[in-house]
Structure formats: structure tokens, C-alpha cells
């Protein structure tokens, strides 16, 4: 029997530094290319290896990006929000939203990300 | 399975016309900025040009107004019309895609990791 996936969202920010490739990574979404149904928000596409993103480590390929430099990311056209990244300076400050899958099965049973057993 | 698989090389005159096409399956086309490279023997491989996923193109300078690259979603294609060929155009031109734009540079950048690439198609301007 297989239990109930569900999801455990949360918010973090995170600073970066542009390094000498820049932030070191992709993002899809925009009001014209909606990633997600129903979201028209910006998410994290891909970690760059070696790049600054990856350095840091706090960010994960699947976050949406809710502000960047206290800039909401909301209704953006995504080449409007590359842009945006583009331009944001060296240091660059990220408010974003990891969405954690969590299993709850029955008792006794073990999700599929738990390193026990 | 991720495949991308172009066609449309071959032998055309200085001044000729081709259209590479780049098929891919496996994955979702419409997030990926799909490029296209050239390598001619002996020479580094070069970034020829791209486009983003939302249909944002870019070139490199020695091709601009020769070369117009397109995608066609519906068909998981994109296209490089290469026209007015020159000799310097000789090359083995393979296709390559990355998820999602970067927020760095454009496809065309150096920096620029794809995630996925053709086996190629030679192109000779003879």
C-alpha cells in the first residue's frame, strides 16, 4: 500500500555572489512559458557545476524564485525575468521556496528518500 | 530516452543554401534552448547560434544575416537556414539543448554547458 505523498514548502533567502561565470544557473516559467500548471512563476532549471549557485549549495534545481533584490517575480514574462537576473548586480539576494516531497504511509513504512535500511 | 539527431548536411557550392533540422525526443522541447556548434578539423569547436526556449535567437557575427535559425515546437524541431555558404563554413554541425535560459549569458556564451547533443551533420562549402 502506498501512502499519500504530500508537501512540506518553505521559504529561504539566500545571498549570492556573482562569480566569475555569473550566478551559475538556468530557470524556465514566465507568464509565457508556464512551467508549472496553473503558476506562471520562475523556477530553477538547472545548477551550474562549479558556478556560484552550486558553491553555496542552498539551491535546488525545482525552487521557484519568488524576489529577487526584493523584486517580486510575479506576472514576469520569462525573458523579462532573465533580464532581471542579468542585471541584478554582484551581489545578488534571492528569496525562493523549496518544496520538500514528504511520504506519509502507513505505519511502518518507508519513503523512498529515507537512507535507513 | 534523449535523442537529437540532425540532418540536412552536405556538399553546396560557395554561395548555395542548406537547412539543418535538429529533431529531439526525450524530454520536454519546449524548456530547452536548443544551439547549434560547428567544428571544422583541426579548429576548436564554436557556438554558430541558438535560441531560447521562448524563441529569443542569437548568432555569431561571421553568420548574421546569412544564417536564421527557427524552432517549430509541435514538431520537437529546430531549424538553421544557412544561406549565401562559404568555403569558411566548412564544418561538422551538431545540435545541442539546455533546460531553461541561463541567467548569465546567452546560448551562445562560452560558459554556456548544454545538456544534451546530436552526433552531427557535415556541412561542405566546396
Known amino acids: 500500500m502506498n501512502g499519500r505523498v504530500d508537501y512540506l514548502v518553505t521559504e529561504e533567502e539566500i545571498n549570492l555572489t556573482r562569480g566569475p561565470s555569473g550566478l551559475g544557473f538556468n530557470i524556465v516559467g514566465g507568464t509565457d512559458q508556464q512551467y508549472v500548471s496553473n503558476d506562471s512563476g520562475i523556477y530553477v532549471s538547472r545548477i551550474k557545476e562549479n558556478g556560484a549557485a552550486a558553491l553555496d549549495g542552498r539551491l535546488q534545481e525545482g525552487d521557484k524564485i519568488l524576489s529577487v533584490n526584493g523584486q517580486d517575480l510575479k506576472n514576469l514574462l520569462h525573458q523579462d525575468a532573465v533580464d532581471l537576473f542579468r542585471n541584478a548586480g554582484y551581489a545578488v539576494s534571492l528569496r525562493v521556496q523549496h518544496r520538500l516531497q514528504v511520504q506519509n504511509g502507513p505505519i511502518g513504512h518507508r519513503g523512498e528518500g529515507d537512507p535507513s535500511g | 530516452d534523449v535523442q537529437l539527431v540532425e540532418s540536412g548536411g552536405g556538399l553546396v557550392q560557395p554561395g548555395g543554401s542548406l537547412r539543418l533540422s535538429c529533431v529531439s525526443s526525450?524530454?520536454?522541447?519546449?524548456?530547452?534552448?536548443i544551439g547549434w556548434f560547428r567544428q571544422a578539423p583541426g579548429k576548436e569547436r564554436e557556438g554558430v547560434s541558438c535560441?531560447?526556449?521562448?524563441?529569443?535567437?542569437y548568432y555569431i557575427d561571421s553568420v548574421k544575416g546569412r544564417f536564421t535559425i527557427s524552432r517549430d515546437n509541435a514538431k520537437n524541431t529546430v531549424y538553421l537556414q544557412m544561406n549565401s555558404l562559404k568555403p569558411e563554413d566548412t564544418a561538422v554541425y551538431y545540435c545541442a539543448a539546455d533546460f531553461g535560459s541561463s541567467v548569465d549569458s546567452t546560448c551562445l556564451s562560452k560558459e554556456q554547458r548544454f545538456d544534451y547533443w546530436g552526433q552531427g551533420t557535415q556541412v561542405t562549402v566546396s
Open positions: 526525450g524530454f520536454i522541447f519546449d524548456y530547452y534552448a
Open positions: 535560441i531560447s526556449s521562448v524563441g529569443r535567437a
